[in-house]
């Protein structure tokens, strides 16, 4: 069961799995829920009573029973992983401890002029994990405003001393802050040959760059897939760093497979939740238990609901056996990986799911698209919502899209003349506006944002959030889009679709039915030619077609411009502005969203 | 028990060659990806030249055109012919099997189905 309270003056006796230092108890609780066994946890706060060197232990502990026996013991604070609730989890840790030296290793020394000047030096380095500043308080002269980036092999210090005038806080990569490009290539036929960190095996590349991804210490991999000609090395993923944080040496080797920690992309890519089966493969590992299961999909669940389990083998019944049941394995290991992978010997297997809340929800998949026709289908943009005003009379006002569980994200220019948000009613999981009577639930609005920097929309800055008075429950039908990584921002999008219940052309009505049309993107430069009378800025982005034909129009302001890249949907823009619609040569105008990534997370994740 | 010895390393003055020689016991060349590293006092463990098992060769930017790999499947034996030696070469050089990389920069950990030699010092003085 799901406990989140800490549990003060307590500690739990025995189960020591390993010890970190963490600056708090509430840290230590979210290390215990990424480490791949940690279930429980004793943290020592700082006191009077205890032995300095124990300050700030986090002692991660594991259980074959999910607890263990509680002991009083002043200034212990003790609790459990979140790996048994169903919540979101984030490592996301914007706290700045006051007075605190983390210790790890020093590799960088500048001078900054504030610690959030020397938290964003450290969340834009590839190494850095968490970083010391020298406030200008600081007793000694010459290391006053000194900003120490540092790293350790976990991610966390080696050590936490008390010290006056400093201040010490995180990295904020795993708060999609960081500006790192993000590189998802896949490079075949290549081995990098830099300093290995540490091994695991892996069923494919792809799993082998997400464990990568959120190794504290990984920054590409080199994956030997099951044809690699050295037998004892088949499905080895080599997790590798150096100190130029790119890889020195490429070689090309047939049946190697290379490529990048999506560390600045992981919130917009799942990084933790492997869900494919892999046919005709046994994971070998240490057995939790052998349960009868009726499919590997029902061995998945069966995994899934087992705490401690991390990856599964299922075993297909010899026909008309047990009840045409097979055999499920679960299992578990040291790090989460299997210790052995086998090939040939008629096994199904696959990875617990229990750690894709620790991913953004946004990259669930969706079931797929009807692909031509200009009407939409239900749980298509399950992020798209519809916006409607109570005054005077009903109706539909914007188009917005779901961020997250309390966010939509819209146009400013939706709210010329709106006065207060009590008229605001958010619609979601709509495909007919028919479908919206009065007993139809919606969201209350509870706050409108708006950027300070917007006049209007053909100058930009058109962008605005509304924060929904209760939070919204994910559903098929209901679900947030990705924002997208500020390392994304080459990316050349080439799947776009704009949505909306807008106008079909300049002079009509809002329409019944959710429309989609796909469009292509524009460059800058070719936007600016065709509106020579504006400034086509950096923090707009255009579709069109040359030819004209398909466009958004009015209502639909607000709307997503959604576009896939690598199987995850992304709002890439807002539609805010254009000349007529869908006019020859007259692209439509979009608020670029990825220049607004910390406006939005700056105003959502304020305290 | 796989075992690589090296052998051939010793002093030198600059401009002066040294030829390397890595022979395996319990082991086969064919199909296996051989490489030399080295390691100086203090710095982390580097790759020098790999030869692979399909016969492609690397170099390091910094022993380019001066360092020649070769091996001998026949003896077992792979070989580092090294020409105009600096001093910034000096430091233990290793043999390695299937090796992709050292272990946290140090030449001896290795990762299943990978193996080091023991070292041989090469000392290059100005």
């Known amino acids: 069961e799901c406990v989140t309270q800490l549990l003060k003056d307590t500690c739990f006796e025995g189960g020591d799995i390993t010890t970190v230092f963490t600056p708090s108890a509430k840290y230590c609780q979210v290390v215990c829920t990424y480490h791949p066994r940690c279930l429980l946890f004793t943290f020592t706060a700082e006191s009077p009573s205890e032995d300095p060197t124990r300050w700030f232990t986090c002692v991660l502990k594991d259980s074959v029973t999910e607890t263990l026996p509680r002991v009083n013991r002043t200034a212990a604070i003790s609790g459990y992983s979140f790996k048994q609730c169903s919540h979101q989890i984030s490592a996301c840790n914007k706290d700045i401890y006051v007075d605190l030296d983390m210790k790890g290793i020093n590799y960088n020394s500048s001078v900054a002029k504030s610690a959030q000047e020397c938290q964003e030096r450290c969340t834009d380095d590839v190494h850095c994990h968490f970083f010391t500043y020298a406030t200008r308080q600081f007793p000694s002269l010459e290391h006053r405003n000194i900003c120490l980036l540092k790293h350790t092999q976990t991610g966390t210090p080696t050590r936490i001393t008390k010290l006056d005038k400093v201040v010490s806080g995180f990295s904020l990569k795993s708060c999609a802050l960081s500006n790192l490009a993000c590189i998802r290539d896949i490079f075949p036929n290549t081995v990098f040959a830099d300093s290995n960190i540490d091994s695991v095996m892996a069923p494919d590349a792809f799993v082998c760059g997400r464990i990568c991804t959120h190794h504290p210490g990984c920054l590409f991999f080199t994956f030997f897939s099951q044809e690699w000609p050295k037998e004892s090395q088949r499905n080895l993923c080599l997790l590798k760093t150096s100190e130029s944080g790119l890889p020195s040496t490429r070689i090309k080797k047939s049946k190697a497979l290379s490529g990048f920690s999506l560390q600045s992309c992981r919130h917009s890519i799942p990084v933790f939740c492997h869900s494919s089966f892999y046919h005709d493969t046994d994971f070998l590992g240490e057995e939790l238990d052998i349960v009868a299961a009726k499919s590997h999909e029902a061995c998945q669940k069966l995994c899934t609901n087992a705490v401690r389990c991390q990856f599964f083998t299922y075993t297909p019944a010899q026909a008309s056996c047990n009840e045409g049941k097979g055999k499920c394995y679960l299992k578990l290991s040291s790090n989460g990986s299997p210790t052995k992978i086998l090939h040939g010997r008629g096994g199904i297997s696959g990875y617990t799911l229990r750690l894709c809340k620790m991913d953004n929800e946004c990259t669930t998949k969706i079931k797929p698209r009807i692909v031509g026709g200009t009407a939409s289908v239900r749980g298509e943009w399950p992020w798209q919502v519809t916006l409607h005003t109570t005054s005077p009379t009903q109706r539909h006002l914007c188009g917005g899209s779901i961020i997250g569980n309390q966010w939509i994200l819209t146009a400013a220019h939706c709210f010329y003349g709106v006065e207060s948000p009590k008229i605001l009613r958010v619609y979601s999981g709509i495909l007919n506006q028919s479908e919206i009577k009065e007993d139809t639930s919606f969201f209350g609005v509870q706050e409108i944002i708006i950027h300070d920097q917007y006049k209007m929309a053909e100058s930009g800055y058109d962008i605005a959030l509304l924060k929904l008075e209760t939070t919204v429950n994910y559903t098929d039908s209901q679900r947030p889009i990705c924002l997208p990584s500020k390392g994304d921002r080459n990316v050349i999008y080439t799947d776009c679709w704009v949505t909306g219940w807008g106008y079909r052309k300049l002079r009509d009505k809002i329409q019944n039915t959710l429309q989609k049309a796909k469009i292509p993107l524009v460059t800058n430069e070719e936007c600016q030619k065709r509106y020579r009378g504006h400034k086509i800025t950096h923090k707009m982005i255009c579709a069109g077609y040359r030819e004209g034909g398909k466009d958004a129009c009015k209502g639909d302001s607000g709307g997503p411009l959604s576009c896939k890249h690598n199987e995850v949907w992304h709002l890439v823009g807002i539609t805010s502005w254009g000349e007529g619609c869908a006019q020859r040569e007259r692209p439509g105008v979009y608020t670029n969203v990825v220049e607004y990534v910390d406006w939005i997370l700056e105003k959502t994740q304020a305290v | 028990q796989v075992q690589l010895q090296e052998s051939g390393g010793g002093s030198v003055q600059a401009g002066g060659s040294l030829r390397l020689s890595c022979t395996a016991s319990?082991?086969?060349?064919?199909?296996?990806?051989m490489a030399w590293y080295r390691q100086a006092p203090g710095n982390e463990c580097e790759l020098v030249s790999t030869?692979?098992?399909?016969?492609?060769?690397y170099y390091a930017d910094s022993v380019k055109g001066r360092f020649t790999i070769s091996q001998d499947n026949a003896k077992n034996t792979m070989y580092l012919q090294m020409n105009n030696l600096k001093p910034e070469d000096t430091a233990v050089y290793y043999c390695?099997?299937?090796?992709?990389?050292?272990?946290?920069?140090?030449?001896?950990?290795?990762?299943?189905?990978?193996?080091w030699g023991q070292g041989t010092q090469v000392t290059v003085s100005s």
């Open positions: 390695a099997a299937d090796q992709w990389g050292s272990a946290e920069g140090d030449c001896t950990s290795s990762y299943p189905g990978g193996y």
């Open positions: 319990e082991f086969t060349f064919d199909d296996s990806d």
């Open positions: 030869i692979t098992s399909d016969g492609g060769t």
